[in-house]
């Protein structure tokens, strides 16, 4: 008799999830020589332990603590780049600007990037059919709680000037409901962070508006200022040129506004 299985609204666990996490861990420790003390099998066991046999709407940050401990890693606190709804460009940027780091440049962020996972209460099975959707089902699901946990820790570690890349093509350039807006902004430490600098990335080639004047950016400025952190904002009118100039800062065309 086929066992009844809860149908969730979101996509199921990414296929070959255990193999992917393990392979990513091995690759990460190969690329980063000072993370070679990390035992990838232990990392996978801790990851698995956070959600296997647990109800996928009842996951807590506490469930991820063993994984957090194993993956403890500190990036230079003054070189942190946050992003919201513009992940690809943020990652392209840190691949060129090698001394800046997004969450996905750390071990735990790298392991989970673009993956989905969940289990089932009281069984050791991984659910490859469906997983809870944050909006339609529940917010305390394995994926959301993971990103909330690592994002909070990442923001708490930041110091000096913190940069955030925001998508100027979206109706809400700053979205209070995004991970950046709901978690990271509120976990920057005013005693360590002097300034949050927003980079608003323009989408259209002919778009010359000052998106730093957008009401949602003003809302971000207000939230940040109330937390005793300075705020600054820059328009990045030409993201392609912006990346090119990061690669080749000596290029004569890089003196003009990008």
């Amino acid at each position: 008799v086929p066992r009844w299985r809860q149908q969730w609204s979101g996509p199921g666990t990414t296929k070959r999830f255990p193999e992917t996490v393990l392979a990513r861990c091995v690759k990460y420790t190969e690329i980063h020589p000072e993370m070679r003390h990390v035992d990838c099998q232990s990392v996978w066991d801790a990851f698995k332990g956070a959600f296997i046999s647990k109800h996928p709407c009842n996951i807590t940050e506490e469930d991820y603590q063993p994984l957090m401990k194993l993956g403890t890693q500190t990036v230079p606190c003054n070189k942190i780049l946050l992003w919201s709804r513009i992940k690809d460009l943020a990652h392209q940027f840190t691949q060129v600007q090698r001394d800046m780091f997004t969450l996905e440049d750390t071990l735990l962020g790298y392991l989970a990037d673009d993956l989905t996972w969940c289990g089932e209460f009281n069984t050791s099975k991984i659910n490859y059919q469906s997983c809870p959707d944050w909006r339609k089902d529940c917010s305390n699901n394995p994926v959301s709680v993971f990103w909330k946990t690592v994002s909070r820790r990442f923001a708490e570690a930041a110091c000096d000037v913190v940069h955030v890349m925001l998508n100027g093509s979206r109706s809400k350039i700053f979205d209070k409901n995004s991970t950046f807006g709901s978690v990271e902004v509120h976990n920057l430490q005013p005693e360590k962070v002097q300034t949050l600098e927003a980079w608003v990335i323009h989408g259209g080639r002919e778009d010359s508006r000052d998106l730093c004047q957008d009401p949602t950016i003003k809302e971000l400025e207000s939230i940040i200022s109330k937390r005793n952190i300075q705020f600054s904002c820059k328009n990045i009118y030409r993201p392609d040129k912006f990346l090119q100039c990061v690669k080749n800062p000596e290029d004569s065309s890089c003196t003009s506004e990008i």
Epitope: I31, E34, R36, T74, V75, D105
Partner: antibody
Framework: QVQLVQSGAEVVKPGASVKVSCKAS????????MHWVKEAPGQGLEWIGY????????NYNQKFQGRATLTADTSASTAYMELSSLRSEDTAVYFC?????????????WGQGTLVTVSS | DIVLTQSPATLSLSPGERATISCRAS??????????MHWYQQKPGQPPRLLIY???SRATGIPARFSGSGSGTDFTLTISPLEPEDFAVYYC?????????FGGGTKLEIK
């Protein structure tokens, strides 16, 4: 600025142990791994291993595994290397060294070195 | 372990000349588009000093006369023109695999 200050020279007997310290300043001690490197007379440089003070993780060169013990006191921002069962070939200058961290795993900062002489 | 073989062991040159030091690895030390090879200079009684990282990038404060090249198993450190303060011992070092290993060193001496 980043500074790594090591303990003074030691003369020890064969079979004994020695513990060399490396006091770090000018940066967040728990954020970077601390490495140890051996320079024996006329022998060049040899990597012993590292400790990641933030999590206590260690990684040893198999050649030194079992005889070298790397520890850290985060409250004192000090790393230690203890070498046991000393023999004459352990006579060397021992350096602590720090890298630039994530994506910059090469030795940017060095201690001044500690000469350990094993002699009866 | 990855063995790094430096040549020559000793190099005798005059200031103003070009020094070329080779470092050959027993297996590739390049991976994922990165070169896990670094170069250091050491003078008597001092710790080593980082010159080149990632095979070809100059460390902060290192003059342009120092350059690094190579990939896979063959790497080169070039110093041109030589200045009097450049006479020292030079080491290559890899961290592609554990244990991290150093070359045997090249002594650059004044002719």
């Amino acid at each position: 600025q980043v500074q790594l200050v090591q303990s003074g020279a030691e003369v020890v007997k064969p079979g004994a142990s020695v513990k060399v310290s490396c006091k770090a300043s000018g940066y967040t001690f728990t954020s970077y791994a601390m490495h140890w490197v051996k320079e024996a007379p006329g022998q060049g440089l040899e990597w012993i291993g590292y400790i990641y003070p933030g999590q206590g993780g260690t990684n040893y060169n198999q050649k030194f595994q079992g005889r070298a013990t790397l520890t850290a006191d985060t409250s004192a921002s000090t790393a230690y290397m203890e070498l046991s069962s000393l023999r004459s070939e352990d006579t060397a200058v021992y350096f602590c060294a720090r890298t630039g961290g994530l994506r910059r795993a090469y030795f940017t900062y060095w201690g001044q070195g500690t000469l350990v002489t094993v002699s009866s | 372990d990855i063995v790094l073989t430096q040549s020559p062991a000793t190099l005798s040159l005059s200031p103003g000349e070009r020094a070329t030091i080779s470092c050959r690895a027993s297996q590739s030390v390049s991976s994922y588009g990165q070169g896990f090879m670094h170069w250091y200079q050491q003078k008597p009684g001092q710790p080593p000093r980082l010159l080149i990282y990632g095979a070809s990038s100059r460390a902060t404060g290192i003059p342009a006369r120092f350059s690094g090249s190579g990939s896979g198993t063959d790497f080169t450190l070039t110093i041109s023109p030589l200045e009097p303060e450049d006479f020292a011992v030079y080491y290559c070092q890899q961290n592609k695999e554990d244990p991290w290993t150093f070359g045997g060193g090249t002594k650059l001496e004044i002719k």
